[in-house]
Interface confidence: low
């Protein structure tokens, strides 16, 4: 039975050219996290494996940095980065938990930075 829940930074916005942190936190379960995948729509951004550490997809390596924690930092944002992002927690014995974040990259300087920088 899957009892865990994922808290995310939710819907966030940021300015073009800036950076943003995507953060998820799995709670209410004693399951062991074996791997966390970060995906944008159907593209793999990064993997954090409990044994092997981080792997950043080559096509994103210049703009995606690991952390803080199991989160992901996106920099040099473009309007094309607008969209859905998913944190996929692979756990044992529960299985897979998925969290969703929607990022909107704005042209203007009125973007509200909704990301929480502290780790829950």
């Amino acid at each position: 039975m899957m009892t865990g829940t994922i808290e995310t930074t939710g819907n966030i916005s940021a300015e073009k050219g800036g950076s943003i942190i995507l953060q998820c936190h799995l709670s209410s379960t004693t399951a062991q996290v074996t791997q966390v995948n970060w995906e944008q729509q159907d593209q793999l951004l990064a993997i954090c494996n409990a044994d092997l550490g981080w792997h950043i997809s080559p096509s994103f390596k210049d703009r995606v940095a690991p952390g803080p924690g199991l989160g992901l930092t996106l920099q040099s944002l473009t309007v094309n980065d607008t969209g859905e992002y998913f944190c996929i927690y692979h756990t044992y014995p529960d299985g897979t938990y998925t969290g969703r974040i929607f990022l909107e990259v704005l042209e203007s300087s009125v973007a509200e930075h909704g990301a929480r920088f502290q780790i829950p």
Epitope: C48, G53, W54, K61, P66, G67, P68, G69, I119
Partner: nanobody
């Protein structure tokens, strides 16, 4: 329990340099990455730089070409070499690494003439 201890902050004139250190302890393995964030008075904490265990580095645009992050994996220590410092670099600098709650106490960097 993972602990992070930053050091190396201080008062420096514009154009000057500082080297920050972050010593991580309590790990049963070498962390796969370490990074630096900073928080200026009245502002949100912002990411500065990260380094993977394999040596790959990332920098915020605001510090590219001026700051260099590195790590000594054998000592679980990260460094931030800061050159050509500007008044807007004034902030408390925090080290962090993998896990859910590893933040150090921070070290204050003040750039002022």
């Amino acid at each position: 329990e993972v602990q992070l201890v930053e050091s190396g902050g201080g008062l420096v004139q514009p154009g000057g340099s500082l080297r920050l250190s972050c010593a991580a302890s309590g790990f049963t393995f070498s962390p796969s990455w370490m990074g630096w964030f900073r928080q200026a008075p009245g502002k949100e904490r912002e990411w500065v730089a990260s380094v993977l265990r394999g040596g790959y580095t990332w920098y915020a645009d605001s510090v590219k070409g001026r700051f260099t992050i590195s790590a000594d994996n054998s000592k679980n220590t990260a460094y931030l070499q800061m050159n050509s410092l500007k008044p807007e670099d004034t902030a408390v600098y925090y080290c962090t690494t993998e896990g859910f709650d590893p933040w150090g106490q921070g070290t204050l960097v003040t750039v002022s003439s």
